[in-house]
């Protein structure tokens, strides 16, 4: 069964900078990845970036840079302009779509006890979805 993992990382040098790493574990090729915050895509979440494996990326503030790391994983750099660092308590979700086979989405957040520069373990939190 395909799975999606999500890691949220606070940058050690800049506490207002966060990076979300997401990856797809499973067979098949990915046709689109969407990253949202505040909840799953379409369930109260706000779109941060959409990545196409061949045609490029689209992103919206506060996303700073979205990019592919491998054929099945992406990263999204975020710039937190607020002094209170709301990202620290925010859920980030990644949805990997493989059209028309299906799409898989998981969410993650920065662990409360995280030290700057340390990433959360890649623990998938699956959201059941079958297209």
């Amino acid at each position: 069964t395909p799975e999606v993992w999500v890691q949220v990382q606070m940058e050690a040098t800049e506490l207002s900078s966060f990076t979300v790493h997401c990856g797809f574990l499973g067979p098949g090729s990915i046709s689109l990845v969407t990253v949202s915050w505040g909840g799953p895509d379409g369930a109260g979440g706000t779109k941060l970036a959409v990545l196409h494996p061949e045609l490029g990326t689209r992103q919206w503030a506060p996303a700073r840079q979205a990019r592919w790391e491998t054929q099945s994983s992406i990263s999204l750099a975020l710039e937190d302009s607020g002094a209170s660092s709301p990202f620290a308590n925010t859920t980030f979700c990644c949805k990997f779509a493989s059209f028309p086979e299906g799409s898989w989405e998981s969410c993650g957040s920065l662990p409360p006890s995280s030290d700057p520069g340390l990433s959360a373990p890649p623990t998938p939190v699956p959201i059941l979805r079958a297209d």
Partner: nanobody, 120 residues
């Protein structure tokens, strides 16, 4: 989450017509395009017709002049009127909502598909 449900497929003779419908429910999709895609047996996916939020419409060369895409925002519905159907139009047709990249609509959400078979 968004749910897209297609209907209107079936068996039709060459030269006949069908009208596919797609009903969207759930949240309002935040993408910027919707469209119809198809997959014939043993073949790859093909974008049939797409429409973006500005109303710009694109058709595959193979269906131009025969197929018409339209939408009803009030009913959250997408349609595909298919006329002068040919055997090569036989495929599973998917309604999809997605994002525009390089002028192409890339699906982010889609339905289960509806079978269209053109045969005498």
């Amino acid at each position: 989450e968004v749910q897209l449900v297609e209907s209107g497929g079936g068996l039709v003779q060459p030269g006949g017509s069908l009208r596919l419908s797609c009903a969207a429910s759930g949240f309002t999709f935040s993408g910027d395009c919707m469209g119809w895609f198809r997959q014939a047996p043993g073949k790859g996916l093909e974008g049939v017709a797409t429409i973006d939020n500005a109303g710009r419409i694109k058709y595959a060369d193979s269906v131009k002049g025969r197929f018409t895409i339209s939408r009803d925002n009030a009913k959250n519905s997408l349609y595909l009127q298919m006329n002068s159907l040919r055997a090569e139009d036989t495929a599973v047709y998917y309604c999809a909502a997605g994002w525009t990249f390089g002028g192409q609509c890339s699906p982010a959400d889609w339905g289960q598909g509806t079978q269209v078979t053109v045969s005498s």
